[in-house]
């Protein structure tokens, strides 16, 4: 069953005398490991003897016999996968067929590999792309069907015998599929490389020449041109003649068409290698070149700049930038077509010559309003002086100037008045379009720049306005100086610091927060009665009768303001105590009698004590003492004592008389 053995290796291997050969080889014998291996050189089967005739280069048998060739020929394989071989050195007479005779437990196999050994190192082979175009990167490949671990080689690229400076990438393959050494060189050929010789040189490890391959480069390129002009500097004056000639220095393939271009545009009916320009005008100034085409494409010559000279044309002024903002910088540029370029300039501002300005540009580092106006210029070259053009207008813009806030009212202004203010300015560019006011309020602006404040507040202190165009300019604030009656009038107790007790020294202060004008008068009043005209009201020794509701008034020339009523409270111990009796001081026994302890006290009496005629305190502590039923024994003098937080007071004695009832008298 021939499918049992599978071999993979290169079909033919190439080498030369004295080099070596490395034979990558794999196999698969499905029925077991390798038992013996013999390497034949040119094995031939002898039908008669049923044996293979040929040189045995290597033998590895069960009995381990190894021939002398073993040193030169090595089996580097194994018993089940690898059948790689090496012959080092390899000789010319090794050329031919190698037979790998292999034996497993159940089968024998002969695998044949061709070996081609040349007398001298064979040349590599250069592979070029089918077409090479200038400036297009190509890969040059140098391939040598040789690689051996024991014999290092190198491939070097030469252009016209000189090593190429581009880096080549060398790769080797020693696989069952292929054995080779390859060098790849990326290269962007120029038209000048056309026809040049490229060499791939095979060298040994020491750089010694072994063999080479050469190719001639066929670089397709557009025509390469040279342009010649008479006069050679290409500078003429109007009316002169000019001749230009186009020469082809190289073209691959041959050129097919010729044309001339001016400033990139093709000139009609100019299809020869010579261009004649007669009586040139300034419009014929420009960049000329010739264009010649082949199958690759068009090639252009270098440009010739033809200069037809003439005096300056009427000038124009360009302003960078208008309108200009005051304080910014401005540049004026005088533009005039001329050849050669103007060498001198004269500048005018509003028709008047600007002294010392002779350059193409005028630079003003800091623009002021007076710089506004019309700017014009005149250009001059060796052929003459140009005319002054229409000029350009410079507009200088600035914020409103000298802004003031003006009060229109007669002075002084009183709280509650209607106040009118106007916002004035001296000049502005562009015009003022709006106004702003500080502080902001719900105020009327009856017309642009006028502010009306209805019912002006006492605290409206200052007002400022701004006049605005593209910018806002603020005026200094103006003081309204609003006059008003005294504000926040109130009574304040200065002393004592604590509550007022009868007999204390007491001072009250009439306070106010502000007044305009500052000059004020004071008035004190109690229950509608005027008490004094000072800011303070003083009591040397306060009495309960001084208690009551006090107000103070403060007035100035604008008006007067009263404080809220302030209650003066005087604290004193119980006084004017007396015992009143109900229904009277004479009561019949058995009835009811009520004794009441009356007093005047602040704060009110909090505690009462009752005493009898023996100054014996009774077990009663309320304001009323009720005797029910009253007895004759209750007759006698009574008094009471009242106590509050300030102190105590006692009443005089009051006598209660209890008389017998008729029943009692009747029983007696």
């Amino acid at each position: 069953d021939s499918s049992k053995w599978v071999f993979e290796h290169p079909e033919t291997l190439y080498a030369w005398e004295g080099a070596c050969v490395w034979i990558p080889c794999t196999y698969r014998a499905l029925d077991g490991d390798l038992e013996s291996f013999i390497l034949f050189h040119n094995p031939e089967y002898n039908k008669n003897t049923s044996k293979f005739d040929g040189t045995r280069l290597y033998e590895s048998t069960k009995d381990g016999k190894v021939p002398s060739e073993q040193k030169r020929v090595q089996f580097l394989g194994d018993k089940n996968k690898n059948c790689t071989l090496s012959i080092h050195p390899v000789h010319l007479n090794d050329s031919g067929q190698l037979g790998l005779r292999m034996e497993s437990k159940t089968e024998k196999w002969m695998e044949r590999i061709h070996l081609n050994v040349s007398e001298r190192p064979f040349p590599p082979h250069i592979q070029l792309p089918p077409e090479i175009q200038e400036s297009q990167e190509v890969t040059l490949t140098c391939l040598l069907n040789f690689s051996c671990y024991g014999y290092p080689i190198q491939l070097q690229w030469l252009l016209e015998g000189v090593p190429m400076r581009q880096a080549a990438v060398t790769s080797t393959s020693l696989t069952i599929k292929s054995v080779f050494t390859r060098s790849e060189l990326k290269f962007s050929p120029q038209w000048s490389h056309h026809g040049k010789i490229v060499t791939c040189q095979l060298q040994d490890a020491d750089g010694k020449f072994l063999s080479n391959d050469t190719v001639q480069l066929n670089v397709k390129h557009t025509p390469k041109l040279e342009i010649k002009v008479t006069p050679s500097d290409a500078i003429v004056r109007e009316g002169d003649s000019v001749t230009m000639t186009c020469e082809v220095s190289s073209s691959n393939p041959e050129y097919t068409t010729v044309s001339w271009l001016k400033d990139g545009t093709s000139l009609k009916k100019q299809n020869t290698f010579t261009l004649n320009l007669r009586e040139v005008t300034k419009d014929q100034s420009g960049k000329y070149c010739c264009q010649v085409s082949n199958d690759v494409g068009p090639g252009r010559s270098e440009e010739v700049f033809l200069q037809v000279q003439y005096a300056p044309e009427p000038s124009t002024v360009q302003i960078l930038h208008s309108p200009a903002v005051e304080g910014s910088q401005v540049e004026f540029l005088c533009m005039s077509l001329a050849n050669p370029l103007p060498t001198n300039y004269t500048w005018y501002h509003n028709g008047k010559e600007m002294q010392g300005r002779t350059e193409e540009k005028v630079h003003i580092p800091k623009i002021l309003p007076w710089h506004a106006g019309t700017y014009s210029c005149v250009a001059e070259n060796i052929l003459g002086t140009g005319q002054r053009g229409p000029g350009a207008e410079l507009d200088v813009q600035y914020p409103p100037k000298k802004v003031t806030t003006v009060i229109q009212n007669p002075m002084p202004i009183r709280e509650g008045d209607t106040v009118t203010l106007s916002c004035n300015y001296n000049s502005s560019n562009p015009s003022v379009t709006r106004y702003e006011w500080k502080p902001h309020g719900a105020w009327e602006e009856p017309s642009l720049g006028v502010l009306k404040i209805q019912n002006v507040g006492w605290d409206n202190t200052t007002i400022a306005c701004a006049a605005c165009n593209s910018w806002c300019s603020w005026a200094s604030p103006v003081a309204l100086n609003v006059q008003y009656a005294p504000r926040d009038v109130r009574v304040r107790k200065i002393k004592p610091l604590s509550e007022i007790h009868s007999g204390n020294s007491v001072s009250l202060q009439c306070d106010f927060s502000s007044s305009h004008p500052k000059e004020v008068q004071f008035f004190w009043e109690k229950n509608g009665r005027l008490l004094g005209k000072e800011s303070q009201l003083n009591f040397d020794s306060i009495s309960p009768e001084d208690a009551g509701s006090y107000s103070c008034w403060v007035n100035n020339s604008i008006g007067q303001t009263a404080s809220k009523a302030w209650t003066l409270e005087v604290l004193y111990a119980p006084r004017r105590l007396r015992v009143s009796m109900s229904p009277g001081d004479q009561v019949m026994e058995g009835k009811s009698a009520t004794l009441t302890c009356e007093s005047d006290a602040n704060p009110p009496v909090s505690h009462y004590t009752w005493f009898d005629w023996n100054n014996q305190s009774l077990p009663y502590h309320s304001q009323k003492l009720r005797l029910e039923p009253v007895k004759v024994q209750h007759s006698g003098a009574y008094w009471c004592q009242g106590t509050n937080s300030v102190g105590k007071g006692r009443s005089p004695l009051s006598t209660l008389t209890v008389y017998y009832s008729p029943e009692t008298i009747g029983r007696r």
Epitope: S2, Y45, S50, T106, E107
Partner: nanobody, 128 residues
Framework: QVQLVESGGGLVQPGDSLRLSCTVS????????MGWFRQAPGKEREAVSC????????YYADSVRGRFTISRDNAKNTVYLEMNSLKPEDTAIYYC?????????????????????WGQGTQVTVSS
């Protein structure tokens, strides 16, 4: 250890027939190539006829083709050589050989190649 035992040789007259048989023992593989070889005095050994066990393909040397027939009995591990119209030049010692199948690339050889296992031989003499 492979053993081959040949039998059937002898002295015959030209034009007679002989049948040689060879029995194999100790050969492990089911697949093999078996053949008859002869060596006349002073001459090199040559293949006479071979047979492949796997497919029964036969080989005959040009000098015996049409006169000799090779056959096998796989069950008995025996190969036979039927020799008719014997000639004096057929005189030789006839050896039986067996070996593993030999493949050269994809080609399978019918005869044993470089074989190791030999019989002791049987003498065939054709003489009038």
């Amino acid at each position: 250890q492979v053993q081959l035992v040949e039998s059937g040789g002898g002295l015959v007259q030209p034009g007679d027939s002989l049948r040689l048989s060879c029995t194999v023992s100790g050969f492990t593989s089911d697949y093999y190539a078996m053949g008859w070889f002869r060596q006349a005095p002073g001459k090199e050994r040559e293949a006479v006829s071979c047979i492949s066990s796997s497919d029964g393909v036969t080989y005959y040397a040009d000098s015996v083709r049409g006169r000799f027939t090779i056959s096998r009995d796989n069950a008995k591990n025996t190969v036979y050589l039927e020799m008719n119209s014997l000639k004096p030049e057929d005189t030789a010692i006839y050896y039986c050989a067996v070996d593993k199948p030999f493949y050269d690339g994809g080609y399978l050889y019918t005869c044993p190649v470089d074989f190791d296992s030999w019989g002791q031989g049987t003498q065939v003499t054709v003489s009038s």
